[in-house]
């Protein structure tokens, strides 16, 4: 094959080599960029900056090598469009520093920075940590800071990420209230801070106020949906990023729903309960307290992390005709109580009749659901019976 006269020449099926002295000052308009998986650049003294726009369209790039060139600055977001990048060799350039943000979000198996005039500062604390933890092949490079000795020896006692404290209201929060949160940020070299509110959706009207070092957030007209939702304060400095999440507990009264009994490895009377704080539960069977045992007990399903409602079953492992009847679930918290009842029939009575049992003459409709604000026993809905004396 004839030698390639261009600044950059194909290498293998999806590679590109750019080694002609001084031919590049940026990476714009590289041929076949969208399919490249490997890019090798050498001897490009005019290539001094690597920025977001330089690597746009290189979405398949896995290996990037820029060596023996004039690179002195890599933007924190330079690799935003190359999420598959796994090997990055920037050795023998003019880099004094490299932001932690540059490699954040990448799964780098290899990062080579040897031969650069690195300047030891807190901004390289992340790289020192990689060296300590044996990441990316960094320890083998024995990185040096220009005129300052090994990177490993850099003092780091003062190199911390920001410290965050989020103040939430002590008092009980009710539906419709306005809630003020404040995030206090401390630390050196603070760069940016803010709130992450992606979980909130329709839970409240949001108003942000203030800036570093004290950020305010007002959640106006809160709803019960705010419960279990994370409100996150974040801040960044040259060392890294810190986040603190809090949740606001919005009080609301207990509610309960019962559903028709289903056979699920024995029997289950499904229920849903809601309320903040979480309500206490009590079962009644035909109006009397039902004591739970290993064969009749409440079992909750795994709760969803972001909601207060709990789903579960009253498990009846071996119900017979004696378990047929009216089941009531009572739920209560300091803000209210609720009940729901359902008729369940698991098995027909195998005996024609027992002289000591009442003979049912009329029943409430099967699977009657009732939900009310208070547990109420409705006397007119209970089945009545006729006792028969047998001589």
């Amino acid at each position: 094959a004839a030698p390639c006269p261009d600044a950059c020449c194909p290498h293998g099926s999806s590679g590109l080599r750019c080694t002609r002295d001084g031919a590049l000052d940026s990476l714009h308009h590289l041929p076949g960029a969208e399919n490249l998986t490997e890019l090798y650049i050498e001897n490009q003294q005019h290539l001094q900056h690597l920025e977001l726009r330089d690597l746009r369209g290189l979405g398949e790039l896995r290996n990037l090598t820029i060596v023996k060139s004039g690179l002195r600055f890599v933007a924190p977001d330079a690799f935003h469009f190359t999420p598959r990048l796994s090997r990055l060799n920037l050795s023998f350039n003019a880099l004094e520093s490299l932001s932690w943000k540059t490699v954040q979000g990448l799964s780098l198996q290899e990062l080579v920075l040897s031969g650069n005039p690195l300047h030891c500062s807190c901004a390289l604390r992340w790289l020192q940590r990689w060296e300590e933890e044996g990441l990316g092949g960094v320890p083998e490079q024995k990185l040096q800071c220009h005129g300052q000795g090994p990177l490993a020896h850099m003092p780091n006692a003062s190199c911390g990420v920001p410290t965050l404290k989020v103040q939430v209201p002590n008092a009980s929060v009710d539906v419709g209230d306005d809630v003020l949160l404040r995030c206090q940020v401390e630390g050196r070299g603070l760069e940016q801070a803010g709130w992450i509110l992606t979980e909130l959706e329709q839970s409240a009207t949001v108003m942000k106020s203030g800036g570093l070092p004290s950020l305010g957030l007002t959640l106006a007209n809160v709803t019960s949906d705010l419960n279990r939702k994370n409100v996150t304060c974040w801040a960044e400095n040259d060392v890294g990023r810190a986040e603190v999440s809090v949740q606001v507990n919005v009080s609301f009264p207990a509610s309960v729903q019962l559903h028709t009994a289903v056979e699920m490895h024995h029997w289950c009377i499904p229920f849903s309960v809601d309320g903040q704080p979480a309500p206490s539960l009590r079962w009644l069977f035909n109006g009397s307290v039902l004591n739970e045992t290993s064969f009749i007990f409440t079992e909750f399903l795994e709760p969803a992390a972001n909601e207060t409602v709990r789903h579960g079953c009253l498990r009846l492992n071996q119900p017979t005709h004696v378990n047929n009847g009216n089941y009531t679930l009572l739920a209560a918290n300091p803000f209210g109580q609720a009940s729901a009842s359902i008729m369940a029939a698991f098995m027909d009575n195998p005996f024609e009749f027992n002289p000591e049992d009442p003979i049912p003459v009329s029943f409430s409709p099967v699977d009657t659901n009732s939900t009310s604000g208070d547990p109420v026993e409705k006397k007119d809905e209970t089945p009545f019976g006729v006792s028969v004396a047998v001589g």
Epitope: N291, F295, R315, N317, Q318, T320
Partner: antibody, heavy 117, light 106 residues
């Protein structure tokens, strides 16, 4: 696989107390009831009570109600049965057994408690 | 308490025999469960919910019954079946066991 491993044999004096442990592995401890059953030498099986680690609910056999205490430590998936004011007729092998939807699916290997002056 | 009475209390039989053990409850129970115990060992679940075989239990074992009367049957005794058998109710507190039936080699 599911394992219930009980503490070792105990020799106690009348009037003393004994605490037997049952360490669970191979399943979600809080999802199953734990039963305690004892068997005196040459005798049948006697149910002492049950505990639900999920909420600490206990049901005791009336016969032992004033002398037995069942507890759990969910952080180490372990159930305990303490029997106080021991008498010579408490000499027995004490078993733990777990149940969820079916009775006593798996049993511990048993702990021999001897009460003798 | 629900009393469970097993009969016979002990029985001698030979390999290949068909054996039936009964368990009578003092009041109606929905289901009966059966356990096998060998000397020095913990009981092992044999049959649950009256007629369901526990995992790994050979099909020569079967259970039946309802109300107050239940039966455990071994269709053709094998040497490893010589043990003590207990019935158990799981319908009311306290849970109770039968006094046991000791099955010996004739």
């Amino acid at each position: 696989q599911v394992q219930l491993v009980q503490s070792g044999a105990e020799v106690k004096k009348p009037g003393a107390s004994v605490k037997v442990s049952c360490k669970s592995s191979g399943y979600t401890f809080t999802n199953y009831w734990m039963h305690w059953v004892r068997q005196a030498p040459g005798q049948g099986l006697e149910w002492m009570g049950e505990i639900y680690p999920n909420n600490g609910r206990v049901n005791y056999n009336e016969k032992f109600k004033n002398r037995v205490t069942m507890t759990v430590d969910i952080s180490i998936s372990t159930a305990y049965m303490e029997l106080s004011r021991l008498r010579s007729d408490d000499t027995a092998v004490y078993y733990c057994a777990r149940s969820r939807y079916d009775p006593m699916e798996d049993w511990g290997q048993g702990t021999t408690v001897t009460v003798s002056s | 308490d629900v009393q469970l009475t097993q009969s016979p209390s002990s029985l001698s039989a030979s390999v290949g025999d068909r054996v039936t053990i009964t368990c009578s409850a003092s009041s109606s129970v929905g289901y009966m469960h059966w356990y096998q115990q060998k000397p020095g060992k913990a009981p092992k679940r044999l049959i649950y919910d009256t007629s369901k075989l526990a995992s790994g239990v050979p099909s020569r074992f079967s259970g039946s019954g309802s109300g107050t009367d239940y039966t455990l049957t071994i269709s053709s005794l094998q040497p490893e079946d010589f043990a003590t058998y207990f019935c158990q109710q799981w319908s009311s507190i306290p849970l109770t066991f039968g006094q046991g039936t000791r099955l010996e080699i004739k």
